[in-house]
């Protein structure tokens, strides 16, 4: 009955501060409405990074000011987090909720450790 969620253990953000990873869930029911939330865990504190609810077969829509974008395909969600800095390095957890129709199901991944390295500033040319 419990829902399993899989995500990669480690991802390295690009030099532009963009990190992408796949969040895949094994659906125990036939959900038509799914909510995906990205959580960040640091020092045992958990905060919400972004969230989107989507209809199966439709695109994910995050809020306009969200740092996340994503696409869905079946039971797989491709998530992209933008604007990351070195201080944002941490564990990013994918949380999936099957909202409709009932029953509700919750699935939480083990987290993806995202490493962000700030680019070195370009040296001044003489």
């Amino acid at each position: 009955k419990a829902m399993h969620v899989a995500q990669p253990a480690v991802v390295l953000a690009s030099s532009r501060g963009i990190a992408s990873f796949v969040c895949e869930y094994a659906s125990p029911g036939k959900a038509t409405e799914v909510r995906v939330t990205v959580l960040r865990q640091a020092d045992s504190q958990v905060t919400e990074v972004c969230a989107a609810t989507y209809m199966m077969g439709n695109e994910l829509t995050f809020l306009d000011d969200s740092i996340c974008t994503g696409t869905s395909s079946g039971n797989q969600v491709n998530l992209t987090i933008q604007g990351l800095r070195a201080m944002d390095t941490g564990l990013y957890i994918c949380k999936v909720e099957l909202m409709y129709p009932p029953p509700y199901y919750l699935g939480i991944g083990n987290g993806t450790q995202i490493y962000v390295i700030d680019p070195e500033p370009c040296p001044d040319s003489d």
Partner: antibody, heavy 118, light 107 residues
Framework: EVQLVESGGGLVKPGGSLRLSCAAS????????MNWVRQAPGKGLEWVSS????????YYADSVKGRFTISRDNAKNSLYLQMNSLRAEDTAVYYC???????????WGQGTMVTVSS | NEVLTQSPGTLSLSPGERATLSCRAS??????LGWYQQKPGQAPRLLIY???TRATGIPDRFSGSGSGTDFTLTITRLEPEDFAVYYC?????????FGQGTKVEIK
Amino acid sequence: EVQLVESGGGLVKPGGSLRLSCAASGFTFSSYSMNWVRQAPGKGLEWVSSISSSSSYIYYADSVKGRFTISRDNAKNSLYLQMNSLRAEDTAVYYCARVGLMGPFDIWGQGTMVTVSS
Amino acid sequence: NEVLTQSPGTLSLSPGERATLSCRASQSVSRYLGWYQQKPGQAPRLLIYGASTRATGIPDRFSGSGSGTDFTLTITRLEPEDFAVYYCQQYGSSPWTFGQGTKVEIK
């Protein structure tokens, strides 16, 4: 301080109605799903109903389906439970509880007592 | 519906002793299991979530273990304030269900 405070409990006759309220403070109420959980005298905990942050998704226990209605007003930081066709077996302390980001019920109110008796 | 069975119903122990409480699920709940403490006249308080993660502010004498169908809450050295009723809860699917509770009383 993160806090939930229930009100509206009391004595009501079988078949009667009651509306419970839960006032939230100290956190962004509109970001969290909320629940009602009850506890009959000397008994264990029983989940009653759940409502998502934007009220889009609502769930009920079979024991109250068709009789109870959960709702919320995010502008007022308040959660409600409208209870109709009350029965003696609905007698309990009713708690409102917040759903934490990782799933469990992480913050609870102090409860309000509902007694259904003739 | 997921049924959670707690054992024993009552545990009689002295302060300083170790308490081991069990919770068994009728089907796998993975690690979507929480433990709550309730004292007389008070609301439940979250102790453990995700089967083994302590909630904020919970002392390290409380620990949780298990996954699937069998779970354990351990209190390593009972303090006077730990005598209470403990409930397990599964939150992986609706309806959300609780065990019937284990009372930890002073021997």
